[in-house]
Every structure is written in structure tokens, then in C-alpha cells.
Interface confidence: low
């Protein structure tokens, strides 16, 4: 249970970085991003490390930049396996990163919000039916 | 300034009810997870609950299960725990807590707290 | 549960003195630990997150290490502001869960 709630601990704090972010999104370079979204299942931990990949970055304007830099770089940092995201890894039938729609950085975090709430709730429901993924 | 401030508490008789509240301000209340932290008269603090920054994932100290609720109104930055079936040993301080965001663990803003006296 | 034993639980010492205050943890928390200090009367003020990043505003001479199940918290030079009781306090798995607390008196 308890690496369980670690990876859960992680997610949300992902979705509460996004949501940081997202204040933030006009000292965000406006380029167009991967941003995957009505993710296949099966496919959601290979659309997460899209959008981990993605090249967000702060447009270097004023006092938000450090704090930007910070939270991009904990978007970017590895959260705790479970037996689902492994399983997944194996998956050579997922898209790639490339063939996702671009889109620029407002909705590209909206995207990937809605993606980590999926994750979660998928997470939570495994959980419901007996099945441990830590 | 950054600020919680806690309302809402008082003296209720066991089994009965209350509704704390927390308004927020000095700072973009939707984007932080918020927790409620409670202290017994003397003793040490205990964890309550916790709800994220869009309320999609809420959790409960075993000993509040099924008889606390917590909530947030990010549109009128506040945060809520509705208290059922209250007992003896709900008296405490309760405080309402921000969680420190940006993938960092720790509270780093908290109310000044306000008194639930449970007591026939 | 994962449950968070500090000692000792409480402690004398003198202004300029160096304290350390430990936090063990029951099974492996990674560094998801903070430490708290509270005055009587008051909210508990956050000293450090991340069991040793420094929080903004607070003195240099507070400071954490540790990870996995063993924490401390030290006080390089007591001031006579730091008689308190400290928490820590872990977020590696839910429920959260704080210390019972170690109250730093004056000898």
C-alpha cells in the first residue's frame, strides 16, 4: 500500500504543479507542443513521458523565471513505477511522441492535467477492485 | 500578505455538528492543495484531511473517516470541513494548512487556528 | 501507518548551545519529511521541507539531514526565540503523520 500512496502522492503533485504553471503560462515560450490527448489505454504512461519530454520552457521575462525553471523541472522528474507503467513500457503499439496533435502551452498543460486526473482515477479504481499496481 | 483564516468553531454537544471554514488570501488559492491539522488540548498535532488543488483527490486520518467532509470553494477562495457526529475527542485546535506546492513537501501556511470544544 | 518517533522528547539546554533533534520514521519515507516549530499559542511555523532545504525567511543556523527512515533537525547556536516544541512531520504516504513532538526548554 504504501509504495501506492507514494506514486499517488507524486501524481498529485504533478496535477497541483500544472495548475502552477498554468498562472504562468504568458512567461511561457509559445511554441507548439506533443500535447496527447483521448489517450488509448494502456498507452496513458507512454503519452505521460511525452509530455514529459516536451520542451517547455520560460521565456526569460521577469522575476517568474527561476520559479518556472523549478516546477518545469519537477514536471520532468520520475515518479515512482508501478507494475502498470511497466507493463506499458513493453507496449510497442503506443504513438509517437511526434504524432500527437501540437499544441501551444495553455492548452498543452490543460492536456496534460487531464491526462494525470485520468492516471489517478485509473490508479484509485485499480485499487478499488483489488488489483495493486506498487 | 499571504493569510489563512479559520471560522466556524465553538462548543457542540457530542453527536452534533459543525462547519469549519478557512478564507484565503495573498496568493492563487486554486493552485495549492490545502490540508486541515488538528491539536488536542496538550498534546501534538494530527493530520485530518487533505484536498487537492481542483478537489480530485481527497483523503482522511482514519480516525475522521465517514464523519468529516472536507471541501473548497476555489471561486471564493475557501476551504471547508464539515464535522458529523462529533465526539469528545474532536476537541482541539483545528487549523487549516496549505500544502507547499510546486512538488515540495511540507505546510508552509497556516491559520491561527480555531477551538472545537465537543462536551455534553 | 508509517509512524514518526523523535527524541528525546523533551530537552534542556542553554542560549549558544548546538541541538540536535532526531526523527525516525518506521519504514523508508525517502526524503519526504519537514520540520516544524511551535510556540505556545501559536500555529506551527515550517523550519525545513524536503527533510534539509531551508525555508525562506528562517535562520541559517536551523538545519535538516537525513533520508530514507532516520532525520535530524539542529540547531547550530540556541537563541533565546528557539524554546519551542518541534515537529516532524512525513508525506511519503497517506495518512500524513507527524512526531509526537520534542519541547526545547531553557536549562
Known amino acids: 500500500m504504501q509504495g501506492q500512496d507514494r506514486h499517488m502522492i507524486r501524481m498529485r503533485q504533478l496535477i497541483d504543479i500544472v495548475d502552477q504553471l498554468k498562472n504562468y503560462v504568458n512567461d511561457l515560450v509559445p511554441e507548439f507542443l506533443p500535447a496527447p490527448e483521448d489517450v488509448e489505454t494502456n498507452c496513458e504512461w507512454s503519452a505521460f513521458s511525452c509530455f514529459q519530454k516536451a520542451q517547455l520552457k520560460s521565456a526569460n521575462t521577469g522575476n517568474n523565471e527561476r520559479i518556472i525553471n523549478v516546477s518545469i523541472k519537477k514536471l520532468k522528474r520520475k515518479p515512482p513505477s508501478t507494475n502498470a507503467g511497466r507493463r506499458q513500457k513493453h507496449r510497442l503499439t503506443c504513438p509517437s511522441c511526434d504524432s500527437y496533435e501540437k499544441k501551444p502551452p495553455k492548452e498543452f498543460l490543460e492536456r496534460f492535467k487531464s491526462l494525470l486526473q485520468k492516471m489517478i482515477h485509473q490508479h484509485l479504481s485499480s485499487r478499488t477492485h483489488g488489483s495493486e499496481d506498487s | 500578505e499571504v493569510q489563512l483564516v479559520e471560522s466556524g468553531g465553538g462548543l457542540v454537544k457530542p453527536g452534533g455538528s459543525l462547519r469549519l471554514s478557512c478564507a484565503a488570501s495573498?496568493?492563487?488559492?486554486?493552485?495549492?492543495?490545502m490540508n486541515w491539522v488538528r491539536q488536542a488540548p496538550g498534546k501534538g498535532l494530527e493530520w485530518v484531511s487533505s484536498?487537492?488543488?481542483?478537489?480530485?483527490?481527497?483523503h482522511y486520518a482514519d480516525s475522521v473517516k465517514g464523519r468529516f467532509t472536507i471541501s473548497r470553494d476555489n471561486a471564493k477562495n475557501s476551504l471547508y470541513l464539515q464535522m458529523n457526529s462529533l465526539r469528545a475527542e474532536d476537541t482541539a485546535v483545528y487549523y487549516c494548512?496549505?500544502?507547499?506546492?510546486?512538488?515540495?513537501?511540507?505546510?508552509?501556511?497556516w491559520g491561527q487556528g480555531t477551538t472545537v470544544t465537543v462536551s455534553s | 501507518a508509517i509512524q514518526l518517533t523523535q527524541s528525546p522528547s523533551s530537552l534542556s539546554a542553554s542560549v549558544g548551545d548546538r541541538v540536535t533533534i532526531t526523527c525516525r520514521a518506521s519504514?523508508?519515507?525517502?526524503?519526504?519529511l519537514a520540520w516544524y516549530q511551535q510556540k505556545p499559542g501559536k500555529a506551527p511555523k515550517i523550519l525545513i521541507h524536503?527533510?534539509?532545504s531551508l525555508e525562506s525567511g528562517v535562520p541559517s543556523r536551523f538545519s535538516g539531514s537525513g533520508s530514507g527512515t532516520d532525520f535530524t533537525l539542529t540547531i547550530s547556536s540556541l537563541q533565546p526565540e528557539d524554546f519551542a516544541t518541534y515537529y516532524c512531520?512525513?508525506?511519503?504516504?497517506?495518512?500524513?503523520?507527524f512526531g509526537q513532538g520534542t519541547k526545547l526548554e531553557i536549562k
Open positions: 494548512v496549505r500544502e507547499r506546492g510546486w512538488g515540495y513537501y511540507g505546510m508552509d501556511v
Open positions: 495573498g496568493f492563487i488559492f486554486s493552485s495549492y492543495s
Open positions: 484536498i487537492t488543488s481542483g478537489s480530485y483527490y481527497i
Open positions: 519504514q523508508d519515507i525517502e526524503s519526504a
Open positions: 524536503d527533510a534539509s
Open positions: 512531520q512525513q508525506f511519503n504516504s497517506y495518512p500524513y503523520t
